[in-house]
């Protein structure tokens, strides 16, 4: 029985971009303006979403598609379909609610977005730190001391444990 | 040995899809970051995309974003690149690549650079 | 146009030493780790040298890498007729949140 209703449903012959008129015995009427149908068979068009303040238009809404919002510069995408707006910080830095700071040491962020986290920990894979981190960036790990002879070709020795002008914080 | 085979590409018209795969053997796919890297003819390499394997953070190039989507299924060692609203300047070569720095241990694949790399699949876009 | 600036071209007669640079900014090489690549014809790039100036094992000691500020260089020594091929730095770039590659310095051995 409900096959058989849908197949006579004149609503099912409305396109995307159209929604079915029920005030105009359920012709096809094309979506009115900021607003937009994705499937066919509807019987309402949506709103289209508005990029407003923070939010910019990344994608104009048509009469078959929603549209897609960005953020200003100085601000990333947060949620689904970017819902949120979140602001940058520099790379070293986190976004706390004081606004941002620069990373503890010990701590980095190579991004714009996110939290500070822990240097990686060299000692957990059996490797030595080839590189020192920074607040910008990671420790990068070599070869375990075990596999370095003299001359290895990839292995400088480790630098200082504390790079000129990161003291902690 | 880190193998990395690219297959889905193909000739497509302006407008239209492809789905581009890359299996994964002889490392823990699971552990790394992945990208995608193509080359035009003739012309430089250019990133694409990133997906991280422990937060499944995904980054895009500019070129890119809103069209392409980036995905992996780590239970099948595999790769995945959907693009979508193909363009002419999309056509490339693409390569899928695997990043150095197994993770979590390794908290920034950056410094490691893209250890591994695919012999690539030809995109067309054409009418 | 690439956020990595390298020269198109580079040349060099075989035992000879070749510099090929990398110039960028703050948000990329200033304060990031710089890659190398090498691409021979018709293949794909291989990892040539990681975190500015380490070499993965298996790349000989002729090549090196350097930074300095926002450049980075790729040093070859005793240039050989099978280091003909395109040599690109990449880094990742905080601002554009990706990675980026220069368009690549091609080599030739004279």
């Known amino acids: 029985f409900e096959r058989t209703r849908s197949l006579q449903d004149p609503c099912s012959n409305c396109p995307a971009g159209t929604f079915c008129d029920n005030n105009r015995n359920q012709i096809c009427s094309p979506c009115p303006p900021n607003s937009f149908s994705s499937a066919g068979g509807q019987r309402t068009c949506d709103i289209c979403r508005q990029c407003k303040g923070v939010f910019r238009t990344r994608k104009e809404c048509s009469s078959t598609s929603n549209a897609e919002c960005d953020c200003t510069p100085g601000f990333h995408c947060l949620g689904a379909g970017c819902s949120m707006c979140e602001q940058d910080c520099k790379q070293g830095q986190e976004l706390t609610k004081k606004g941002c700071k620069d990373c503890c040491f010990g701590t980095f962020n190579d991004q714009k977005r996110g939290i500070c986290r822990p240097w990686t920990n060299c000692s957990l894979d059996g490797k030595s730190v080839l590189v020192n981190g920074t607040k910008e960036r990671d420790v990068v790990c070599g070869p375990s001391p075990a596999d370095l002879s003299p001359g290895a070709s990839s292995v400088t020795p480790p630098a200082p444990a504390r790079e000129p002008g990161h003291s902690p914080q | 040995e880190v193998q990395l085979l690219e297959s889905g590409g193909g000739l497509v018209q302006p407008g239209g899809s492809l789905r581009l795969s890359c299996a994964a053997s002889g490392f823990t796919f699971s552990g790394y970051d992945m990208s995608w890297v193509r080359q035009a003819p003739g012309k430089c390499l250019e990133w694409v995309s990133v997906i991280y394997p422990d937060d499944g953070n995904t980054y895009y190039a500019d070129s890119v974003k809103g069209r392409f989507t980036i995905s992996r299924d780590n239970s099948k060692n595999t790769l995945y690149l959907q693009m979508n609203s193909l363009r002419a300047e999309d056509t490339a070569v693409y390569y899928c690549a695997k990043h150095g720095g197994q993770k979590p241990t390794t908290k920034s694949s950056s410094a490691y650079g893209m250890d591994g790399w695919g012999q690539g699949t030809l995109v067309t876009v054409s009418s | 146009q690439s956020v990595l600036t390298q020269p198109p071209s580079a040349s060099g007669t075989p035992g000879q030493r070749v510099t090929i640079s990398c110039s960028g900014s703050s948000s990329n090489i200033g304060n990031n780790y710089v890659t190398w690549y090498q691409q021979l014809p018709g293949t794909a790039p291989k990892l040539l040298i990681y975190a500015d100036s380490h070499r993965p094992s298996g790349v000989p000691d002729r090549f090196s890498g350097s930074k300095s500020g926002t450049s980075a260089s790729l040093a070859i020594s005793g240039l050989r007729s099978e280091d003909e091929a395109d040599y690109y730095c990449?880094?990742?770039?905080?601002?554009?949140?990706?990675?980026?590659f220069g368009c690549g310095t091609k080599l030739t051995v004279l």
């Open positions: 990449a880094t990742w770039d905080y601002s554009l949140s990706g990675y980026v």
